[in-house]
Interface confidence: low
């Protein structure tokens, strides 16, 4: 609570996060022209990433185009992109949605339909759905240790929300357990009152705040965090804005000397720590 | 405008862009001794990262250095590391400047140069100029989508710089369209008071301000952002401090069972967000 | 101090780091059985990654498990890991220690001791302790130079930390040199009264603050920046929330159409720009 | 060594109530799903009530459904069963275990193959 002959500082705060889990993934494969189920175990090191301080992210679900390399070919036949003849196609025409420069010539794409022909990275990604469910949507149970260090430089107090008495296999609960800071991920969007296994699919921002009101009079001392959670991305936002979360990456490799590339387009939800709060003294 | 009688509170805020564009590159290329004219297609997975928050990258420019292998070889004769004798080599001294560490001999580094050996990737790399005009000098046609979601929790008040109403195919503009938050790079830049072509060589870091100046009372609510621009580069910063924004980073592959990597320096422009403001509520 | 007639504003502000520094790693490579030791140079495209803003890591350690490739193999043998039988394996269960899906049969690990066979990444990452010393200890002779530009928008005020008088060779120091934005860590360290050869080996984070006192009334103006240093992650931290500052990465690569990977955990420090202050003005 | 230490049995009569704590030691109680089996004497051991880890839900055998039930506290890293309306057919030696439970939903014999178990404590009921 306010008060008014206190003085009030802001916080200066430092996090760091670990994220824990497995998952197995399920998909089609497709070699030598043969599609058969393929299982494969991703761990941290595949699904999130060296990230800096108040964020990071857990891919939920891809999208891959494998053995990409520099060339000619069709773009892909996207609403309103096929073509019937070469005046329809614009040499150097960079279309905002294609990827790639047309170089003026009307190609087929497959055996009905034909599209302009582009410089890219070949051949083009398709622009099919993310995967429904999604294939990473295990990582519901996947948990995240939030280390939060915090500091109030004018009253020169410093603290952490681990304490020493804190027990390393509890898990963060509202009722039970409101200051574990291990939290299962499920857990954060029950809390948030999303659907865990809806967002996996498109991916999102997720917004853990951790409150800090600290209270630093020797008689009154008290100064723990207070954690809740609410969506940040705008889940009935418009296609044209780009919904959900996603970004595309790449592994580059050499196959006879040509430089080929995988192209993931990786969809997940990306967890900003957002830490705020006062520290009052008399 | 500031209302005494207002309970003031900082804004809590999260960030999400998204980069638009692709860039044909063309440089020289050097195969098997013959030099030729390379023309390739960037996109958003080549000339920008999975970055976190408040911060994009877009490269404009780069200097390969391809095929290093750890093992010994002269070093690059800058100014002032040329030798004639072993004597002027150090065994085991890393000059700050240099890319590895002597050996103490003093080696050929072509016809008419020596240099100290050193135990590095090897070739060295050549500190040559960043190739101007830069090589991505396109990428000021690229468009950044900004979504900015904030929060009062002292008001208990939430908003996004998107709104339902808005055009997804809009293009920011501060007479004609100030809310739009979809940004051409050029046009930040000449908001600024900045070249991008200039700028796009040796990379620099470009400040996007949105300033929510918010009034919460239910009889005079008001709370949309402002953008401006400004430069957080010096652009007239000595060479030893560094100027413009570039780092390096590597592809590491293995060729005949021994590791090698394609070192790269990319200059481009961060951008960092800053989001900012109050929100006033009696 | 504090003017009670001024207007007091905080800063915005915009960080820019660049590390220097090269590393002779000297560490026992085993290859067709045979174990030798192995010299190598790591650079800042090895050893620091591209990061955003207020934050930069480098690495002081590594532990690598090399050419894991997905299929099926006993877990390690960690603390009560190990089996006697399948029944202590339970078909689809993922110990949370565990890197990967049990398949529910007991399988020989070595010559003495059986363990749950897995599906993962194989053959998993051995749990040894990080190597002492670190392999990467001399970080502590790296220097880090940082660019910090403030804003104090309402003030319509800005500056920077690097003045143009200041010598781009100068290392910072609290009695001789505190305006001198280029660092030394292992001076980093010292000023925060920690051990940087310990704290390498399994990592940690430093926060160095930087805090602004600003007075620009014009008759009595005034605007530099003090720095100052404090370990941000807590060295007595039990086992169970993940002492020091670690993370795994993979590179991945195809060997005959099998795609591996190799998998690295990286110990090393993160260092945290923490920048705060005011700007007064009547 | 994992530890799964019960307390809380003894001799009740019939329509008494008992709670039975269960605590673990050096391990991850919110990684394992949590069990209360029994075992009377000349008879096999059963499944009396689950605690599921990844949804928290919870399964009771059909003879102790209503009157049994089972809890958890995070802080004290202990898991309770409370037994109310106990009947002589409610002897046994009530066991606490921890491991993974394939069926979900269910806690019935023959579903179970916990990694964990404690030492047993003993309930009788009898007038």
């Known amino acids: 609570s306010d008060k008014l002959y206190q003085r009030k500082e802001p916080v200066i705060s430092s996090v760091h996060t670990k994220v824990k889990g497995i998952a197995e993934v399920t998909e089609n494969v497709t070699e030598g022209g043969v599609t058969k189920l393929g299982h494969s175990i991703f761990d941290t090191a595949d699904y999130t990433f060296p990230l800096q301080g108040n964020s990071f992210f857990v891919m939920t679900n891809y999208v891959k185009s494998e053995g990409q390399v520099q060339t000619l070919c069709p773009e892909y036949p996207r609403r309103g992109a096929q073509c019937s003849s070469d005046r329809r196609c614009k040499k150097g025409w960079m279309d905002p949605q294609s990827k790639g420069i047309q170089t003026g010539r009307c190609v087929p794409y497959d055996k009905t339909r034909k599209t302009c022909e582009v410089s890219a990275w070949c051949p083009t990604e398709e622009e099919k759905e993310a995967p429904r469910p999604a294939l990473l949507r295990s990582a519901e149970n996947f948990t995240v240790l939030i280390k939060n260090n915090i500091h109030f430089p004018g009253h020169n107090y410093t603290t952490r929300n681990i304490l020493p008495t804190m027990n390393g296999s509890c898990t963060f609960h509202k009722a039970w357990d409101p200051q574990c800071s291990i939290f299962r991920l499920g857990d954060i969007f029950q809390e948030a009152g999303e659907n865990f296994t809806e967002v996996a699919v498109q991916g999102g921002i997720m917004g853990i705040e951790i409150y800090w009101d600290c209270n630093l009079d020797s008689w009154s001392h008290h100064c723990r965090p207070r954690y809740s959670f609410r969506r940040l991305d705008d889940k009935n936002m418009d296609e044209s804005f780009v919904p959900g979360y996603n970004f595309r990456y790449a592994k580059y490799y050499k196959e006879n000397n040509v430089e080929k590339r995988t192209l993931i387009k990786a969809f997940g939800i990306r967890f900003d720590i957002l830490v705020f709060g006062t520290g009052g003294k008399f | 405008s500031d209302k005494l009688y207002q309970r003031k509170e900082p804004v809590i805020s999260s960030v999400h862009t998204k980069v638009k564009g692709i860039a044909e590159v063309t440089e020289n290329v050097t195969e098997g001794g013959v030099t030729k004219l390379g023309h390739s297609i960037f996109d958003t997975a080549d000339y920008t990262f999975p970055l976190q928050g408040n911060s994009f990258f877009v490269m404009t420019n780069y200097v390969k250095s391809e095929g290093q292998v750890q093992t010994l070889c002269p070093e690059y004769p800058r100014r002032g590391a040329q030798c004639s004798s072993d004597r002027r080599c150090k065994k085991g001294w890393m000059d700050p400047q240099s890319k590895g560490i002597q050996t103490g001999r003093c080696v050929p580094y072509d016809k008419t140069r020596k240099t100290c050996e050193v135990s590095a990737w090897c070739p060295t790399e050549e500190e040559k100029e960043a190739p101007r005009p830069a090589l991505l000098r396109s990428a000021e046609n690229f468009t950044v989508l900004i979504k900015n979601n904030i929060h009062f929790p002292g008001h208990n008040y939430t908003t996004r710089n998107i709104l339902p109403t808005m055009n997804g195919s809009c293009t920011f503009h501060k007479a004609w369209d100030p809310q739009c938050s979809i940004f051409r790079l050029g046009d930040i830049f000449q908001e600024a008071g900045e070249n991008f072509t200039e700028v796009a060589v040796q990379g620099g870091i470009m400040g996007i301000e949105i300033y929510w100046d918010c009034n919460l009372d239910s009889w005079s609510h008001h709370c949309r952002p402002r953008y401006s621009f400004r430069r957080l580069d010096d652009k007239n910063m000595d060479e030893s401090f560094v100027p413009g924004y570039n780092f390096r980073y590597a592809k590491y592959y293995k060729e005949n069972n021994v590791e090698k990597r394609t070192l790269i320096k990319a200059f481009g422009i961060r951008f960092d967000i800053l989001v900012f403001g109050t929100g006033g509520k009696f | 101090s504090d003017k009670l007639y001024q207007r007091k504003e905080p800063v915005i502000s915009s960080v820019h780091t660049k590390v220097k520094g090269i590393a002779e790693v000297t560490e026992n490579v085993t290859e067709g059985g045979v174990t030798k030791l192995g010299h190598s140079i790591f650079d800042t495209a090895d050893y620091t990654f591209p990061l955003q803003g207020n934050s930069f890591f480098v690495m002081t350690n590594y532990v690598k498990s090399e050419g894991q490739v997905q299929t099926l193999c006993p877990e390690y043998p960690r603390r009560g890991a190990q089996c006697s039988s399948d029944r202590r394996c339970k078909k689809g269960w993922m110990d949370p220690q565990s890197k990967g899906i049990q398949t529910g049969r007991c399988v020989p690990y070595d010559k003495t001791r059986k363990t749950c066979e897995v599906s993962a990444w194989c053959p998993t990452e051995e749990e040894k302790e990080a190597p002492r010393p670190a392999l990467l200890r001399s970080a502590e002779n790296f220097t880090v130079l940082i660019k910090n530009n403030i804003h104090f928008p309402g003030h319509n005020y800005t500056t920077r930390n690097i003045l143009p008088t200041m010598n781009g060779s100068c290392t910072f120091h609290k009695a001789w040199d505190p305006q001198c934005s280029i660092f030394r860590l292992g001076d980093i360290f010292q000023e925060a009264g920690e051990n940087f050869t310990e704290v390498a080996v399994q990592g940690g984070i430093m926060g160095i603050e930087i805090y602004w006192d600003c007075n620009l009334d014009s008759w009595s103006h005034h605007c530099r920046p003090r720095y100052s240093f404090r370990r941000l992650d807590d060295k007595n931290m039990d086992e169970s929330f993940v002492p020091g500052y670690n993370f795994r990465y993979a590179k991945y690569y195809k060997e005959n159409n099998v795609e591996k990977r190799t998998l690295i955990k990286a110990f090393g420090i993160r260092f945290d720009i923490l920048v705060f202050g005011t700007g007064g003005k009547f | 060594e994992v530890q799964l230490v019960e307390s809380g049995g003894g001799l009740v009569q019939p329509g008494e109530s008992l709670r039975l704590s269960c605590t673990a030691s050096?391990?991850?109680?919110?990684?394992?799903?949590i069990g209360w089996f029994r075992q009377a004497p000349g008879k096999e051991r059963e499944g009396v009530s689950c605690?599921?880890?990844?949804?928290?839900?919870?399964a009771y055998a059909d003879s102790v459904k209503g009157r049994f039930t089972i809890s958890r506290d995070i802080v004290k890293h202990t898991v309770y069963l409370q037994m109310n309306s106990l009947q002589p057919e409610d002897t046994a030696v009530y066991y606490c275990?921890?491991?993974?439970?394939?069926?979900?939903?269910?806690?019935?014999?023959?579903?179970?193959?916990?990694?964990?178990w404690g030492e047993g404590t003993l309930v009788t009921v009898s007038s």
């Open positions: 605690r599921f880890t990844n949804d928290g839900s919870t």
């Open positions: 050096r391990f991850m109680l919110d990684y394992y799903d």
């Open positions: 275990a921890a491991g993974p439970l394939t069926k979900r939903r269910q806690c019935v014999p023959g579903d179970f193959s916990m990694d964990f």
